[in-house]
């Protein structure tokens, strides 16, 4: 049995121009310490979308579900999509650490976006 | 019925050690974060030891750091904690705790009486 | 580390009435919309019971005169209305991301 899985229920999410997208992640436990991060793409050349402690980040806000009991829930909506944001972006959680350590990401969740 | 026994408590003099166990049922341990959290008089509630679901993660407060070992058996159900270099200020009932999430304390044994003295 | 101070030290409520205790973190324990604040019981010589976990969840099985409130650094337990069995020392507990965890100091609720 997995210490901790990172799950991200949704394949793909498809969203009209100018609407908001929610992407669902869930950690099942808070051990190992450390934040979760959302990537857009994978690689060196990935772009980070949220990190709750550092950056700025105007169109993305967490809207997590704190009632639920059995796992965390980190989820993102990010406002205002335009056809730029396509893509698939993936739940990563760290390790705290100097400097964090990845451990594992969600299996990531394809946006896609629709004319308005 | 969720129960966590624990067991191992006494009296040492300074310096000594004690290892201290949890044996746990009515829940499935191997997917539960598991910890130590004392309690004195004097302190309140101290947060000892946490251990993640499958015992790759251990974390201490700089009060015990190097001197207490947590670690778990999920086979048999149980948690250990080692303490080492005891000192009189951990003196205290120690309690062993379930945690479903990692985050809050939801189930706590009956606390054993760890007693430090010369 | 983060400081819990918890208020009042002890607190004596009638039957009936309204019992409310505070807990002021040193630095915020709230992360992607969740507060890592929780809140126990315990009642003489027995372990810590869970009443409200992130702040302001009930636990499965606690009466709902139990209610938590709060984000950030500032939580709130209230207990409305007050009855003879909840006659027992509360405390809280942060359990954030900055190590170590840690608790408030208690407060001892009495009947007046």
């Known amino acids: 049995e997995e210490e901790l899985q990172v799950i991200q229920p949704e394949k793909s999410v498809s969203v009209a121009a100018g609407e908001s997208a929610t992407l669902n992640c869930t950690a099942t436990s808070l051990i190992p310490v450390g934040p979760i991060q959302w990537f857009r793409g994978v690689g060196p050349g990935r772009e980070l979308i949220y990190h709750q402690k550092e950056g700025h980040f105007p169109r993305v806000t967490p809207v997590s579900d704190p009632t639920k009991r059995n796992n965390m829930d980190f989820s993102i909506r990010i406002s205002n999509i335009t056809p730029a944001d396509a893509g698939t972006y993936y739940c990563v959680k760290f390790r705290k650490g100097s400097p964090d350590v990845e451990l594992k990401s969600g299996a990531g969740t394809e946006l896609s976006v629709r004319a308005k | 019925e969720v129960q966590l026994v624990e067991s191992g408590g006494g009296l040492v003099k300074p310096g000594g050690s004690l290892r201290l166990s949890c044996a746990a049922s009515g829940f499935t341990f191997s997917s539960y974060v598991m910890s130590w959290v004392r309690q004195t008089p004097g302190k309140g509630l101290e947060w000892v030891a946490t251990?993640?679901?499958?015992?790759?993660?251990?974390y201490y407060p700089d009060s015990v750091k190097g001197r207490f070992t947590l670690s778990r058996d999920n086979a048999k159900n149980s948690l250990y904690l080692q303490m080492n270099s005891l000192r009189a200020e951990d003196t205290a009932v120690y309690y062993c705790?379930?945690?479903?999430?990692?985050?809050?304390?939801?189930?706590w044994g009956q606390g054993t009486t760890v007693t430090v003295s010369s | 580390d983060i400081v819990i101070t918890q208020s009042p030290a002890s607190l004596a409520v009638s039957l009936g009435e309204r019992a409310t205790i505070s807990c002021r973190a040193s630095e915020s324990v709230d992360s992607y919309g969740m507060s890592f604040m929780h809140w126990y019981q315990q009642k003489p010589g027995q372990p810590p019971k869970l009443l409200i976990y992130r702040a302001s969840n009930l636990e499965s099985g606690v009466p709902d005169r139990f209610s938590g409130s709060g984000s950030r650094t500032d939580f709130t337990l209230t207990i409305n209305p007050l009855q003879a069995e909840d006659v027992a020392t509360y405390y809280c507990?942060?359990?954030?991301?900055?190590?170590?965890?840690?608790f408030g100091g208690g407060t001892k609720v009495e009947i007046k």
């Open positions: 705790a379930s945690s479903v999430d990692g985050s809050a304390f939801d189930y």
């Open positions: 507990h942060q359990s954030s991301e900055n190590l170590p965890w840690t």
């Open positions: 251990i993640s679901s499958g015992g790759t993660y251990t």
